[in-house]
């Protein structure tokens, strides 16, 4: 029950996270106008990964794509790539995890197959979340670097002429959405990986009786009533008498119908 809950919760958390990554990637407010020294303005500027927008005080908004520009920096292209990779991996992870859900029965799919699929989707979610966090962080670093460089230019000037700055751009809502969404996807992925451990059937469940002398499991030995429980002087699983009991090595080599309880 706990495994199903962990898996289900992991799926839902990842689903919300990936939806957030998609939303952040599409949002225009990756960087917004910093109103420092400019509290009253009739124009509000903000930029996304794909286009720049201007909102007038009247409410009219106009946006322009970056395709008509002279050049896009490698950093922006890298951010775009990271976000898209995150979305693609997340989408595939969601698809895989749907079939891996314990509460959904598809044909005669074994638990081991579901466990493998759960682990695969979990890893995909983790990588997806990391991609989103990395992409958003790279963009944030670009803004921080520029913010301080432009601040420095306010005082030092450029080419011997004064370079003052009217507007600077700071973190937009999309950055916070991206960070939170990436974190949720990452958490969801970890939960799926944890759930995978509970789904995987332990092979030792079937062999523990005859292979291990430890514990309270008692194997029935034909020809006598004395059996080792793992306590006392017989912890090495030595021969007690020849009436049918065998050493651990012998049992492993020649299993009989009596070896499985």
């Amino acid at each position: 029950m706990a495994v199903t809950a962990c898996q289900g919760l992991g799926f839902v958390v990842s689903l919300i996270g990936i939806a957030g990554i998609i939303a952040a990637t599409c949002m225009d407010q990756w960087s917004t106008q910093d109103l420092y020294n400019n509290p009253v303005t009739a124009v509000f500027n903000y930029q996304g990964l794909w286009r720049s927008c201007v909102r007038e005080s009247s409410g009219f908004t106009e946006c322009r794509g970056y395709f008509t520009l002279l050049g896009l920096p490698a950093m922006l292209q890298a951010v775009r790539a990271l976000m898209i990779v995150g979305i693609v991996l997340g989408a595939i992870g969601l698809l895989v995890s749907i079939f891996a859900l314990k509460c959904i029965r598809i044909g005669s799919m074994e638990d081991s197959a579901k466990a493998n699929m759960t682990l695969t989707s979990g890893i995909m979610f983790i990588v997806s979340g990391l991609c989103a966090i990395a992409g958003v962080s790279v963009f944030a670093n670009m803004l921080v670097t520029n913010f301080w460089m432009s601040t420095a230019n306010m005082y030092t000037g450029m080419g011997g002429m004064v370079q003052t700055v009217q507007t600077r751009y700071t973190f937009g809502a999309a950055l916070f959405v991206g960070w939170v969404a990436g974190g949720l996807t990452l958490i969801g992925g970890v939960m799926m990986c944890i759930a995978c451990r509970g789904l995987a059937p332990e092979e030792t469940n079937y062999k523990a009786v005859s292979y291990h002398a430890s514990g309270h499991s008692v194997a029935y030995k034909p020809g006598g009533f004395k059996a080792s429980t793992g306590f006392g002087s017989n912890t090495k699983n030595k021969k007690i008498y020849d009436g049918g009991a065998r050493t651990e090595d012998e049992v492993q080599s020649y299993p009989s119908k009596h070896d499985y309880v």
């Epitope: 050049g71 803004l143 370079q163």
Partner: nanobody, 129 residues
Framework: EVQLVESGGGSVQPGGSLSLSCAAS????????MAWFRQGPGKEREVVAT????????YYTDSVKGRFTISQDADKNRVYLQMDSLKPEDTAMYYC??????????????????????WGQGTRVTVSS
Amino acid sequence: EVQLVESGGGSVQPGGSLSLSCAASGDTFRAKCMAWFRQGPGKEREVVATIQSGYYRPYYTDSVKGRFTISQDADKNRVYLQMDSLKPEDTAMYYCAADRFTYPPGVICGGISENYRYWGQGTRVTVSS
């Protein structure tokens, strides 16, 4: 709206220097991306340099890199183009242009002339011996 007025043009010998100035008036807060364009005789209008309000890295077309410097004084709503080591091929009508769009760091603002909403009347620069 934004009004742009250029000044500083004139005739100069090859290797000489000129400083162009562009004064913005009106709704100057709209002029986020400032640029200098030029149009030589019988040529297409081309971007020379661009600078974005709030971003420190200007853009220069390959033919003027190392020779021209664009800068702005936002307090006085002016943009400048310092032209050194002038060549005869720099002879053209120079236009100041402004755009109200801004872009993320590293993205070269402006680009094609169609992106600019506000234009000045231009100032002529002649480089000849």
